[in-house]
Interface confidence: medium
């Protein structure tokens, strides 16, 4: 899916009301300085690839982080915001519902979401215009 | 490991223009911001301004708009730091600063040597 | 534009004392940093958004604060806490206060 056409300010204000807390959430007991940080993004669509990319395709050690409450708030925001973005989820939310049975917290997956902290910290980055 | 290495020491006249480089190595050059800020003798800190290598996009703190500009080369991995009509009050290192964003509010987390600036006449 | 007010610009005390290093915004602000430097050499990160310590700063060094009002802590001063600091912000521009040199009583 191509992030360039979302409604980017929508999005930043659905991730500061909520999704910045479920993620703190799931973090809780975790020290800020546990995870050194190696995914990136540039731009705020290569940073939302990035972020769906993280959130919802399971990765070894991790396959439990979609039915997350932060999980779910930001399909809800990327459907909302993103045009198009719902009917190129419907295949791949199939899949994810008979991959995943129980939600399972392991260290990967703490490690996985601080990238996702990382990654939604760079995508609310103040942007700079060419002047 | 990130580095950030600046140009050598300059000596200018009033009037004259300077321009520092800050040659970047150990992360991907345009996924971060990168600052420049300045220190007189003696004085505080000064932000001057700050760039995106990505999009070469800025932002310019109003005393010195107009007589700054900040540009990059992405493939040398380089920012710049011009500074034009120059006057004794300008003599101060200037750094060139990372702007991290692995912690909420933006900080400096990795910043150069420092290039000395000397205007006299 | 915010201005950033650092008091006191100089701190006098003893190795062993505590230090409280304050950052006034002429505007709220979300998050406050804190640098440290000692002569000659270029600014170091102390304290990212508000309370987070750099790595390597030691557990004796605290950061608090919100909207106006920011302070660094130091609970003992050791020999090589004293420099100066700076308190900055990047809500509007990226901005720093004046500085607070703790020097040795």
């Known amino acids: 899916y191509d992030f360039t056409n979302c409604d980017f300010e929508k999005i930043k204000a659905a991730y500061l009301s909520t999704i910045s807390k479920d993620l703190i959430t799931y973090m809780s007991g975790t020290k800020s300085t546990e995870f050194n940080n190696t995914v990136s993004c540039s731009n705020r669509p290569h940073c939302l690839t990035e972020i769906q990319s993280l959130t919802f395709n399971p990765t070894a050690g991790c396959a439990s982080l979609a039915k997350e409450m932060f999980a779910m708030k930001t399909k809800a925001a990327l459907a909302i915001w993103c045009p198009g973005y719902s009917e190129t989820q419907i295949n791949a939310t199939q899949a994810m519902k008979k991959a995943r049975k129980s939600k399972v917290t392991t260290n990967k997956c703490l490690e996985q979401v601080s990238q996702l902290q990382g990654l939604w910290r760079r995508f609310n980055r103040p942007l700079l215009k060419q002047q | 490991e990130v580095q950030l290495v600046q140009s050598g020491a300059e000596v200018k006249k009033p009037g004259a223009s300077v321009k520092v480089s800050c040659k970047a190595s150990?992360?991907?050059?345009?996924?971060?911001?990168m600052n420049w800020v300045r220190q007189a003798p003696g004085q505080r800190l000064e932000w001057m301004g700050i760039?995106?290598?990505?999009?070469?996009?800025?932002s310019y703190n109003q005393k010195f708009k107009g007589r700054v500009t900040l540009t990059v080369d992405k493939s040398a991995s380089t920012a710049y730091m011009e500074l034009s009509s120059l006057r004794s009050e300008d003599t101060a290192v200037y750094y060139c600063?990372?702007?991290?964003?692995?912690?909420?509010?933006?900080?400096?987390?990795?910043w150069g040597q420092g290039t000395t600036v000397t205007v006299s006449s | 534009e915010i201005v950033l007010t650092q008091s006191p610009a100089t701190l006098s005390l003893s190795p062993g004392e505590r230090a409280t290093l304050s950052c006034r915004a002429s505007s709220s602000v979300s998050y406050m940093h804190w640098y440290q430097q000692k002569p000659g050499q270029a600014p170091r990160p102390w304290i990212y958004?508000?309370?987070n310590l750099a790595s390597g700063v030691p557990a004796r060094f605290s950061g608090s604060g919100s909207g106006t009002s920011y302070t660094l802590t130091i609970s003992r001063l050791e020999p090589e806490d004293f420099a100066v600091y700076y308190c900055?912000?990047?809500?509007?521009?990226?901005?720093f206060g004046g500085g607070t040199k703790v020097e040795i009583k």
């Open positions: 900055q912000q990047s809500d509007s521009g990226r901005e």
């Open positions: 600063a990372r702007e991290d964003y692995d912690y909420d509010g933006y900080a400096m987390d990795y």
């Open positions: 958004a508000t309370s």
């Open positions: 150990g992360y991907t050059f345009t996924d971060d911001y």
């Open positions: 760039i995106s290598p990505y999009n070469g996009g800025t």
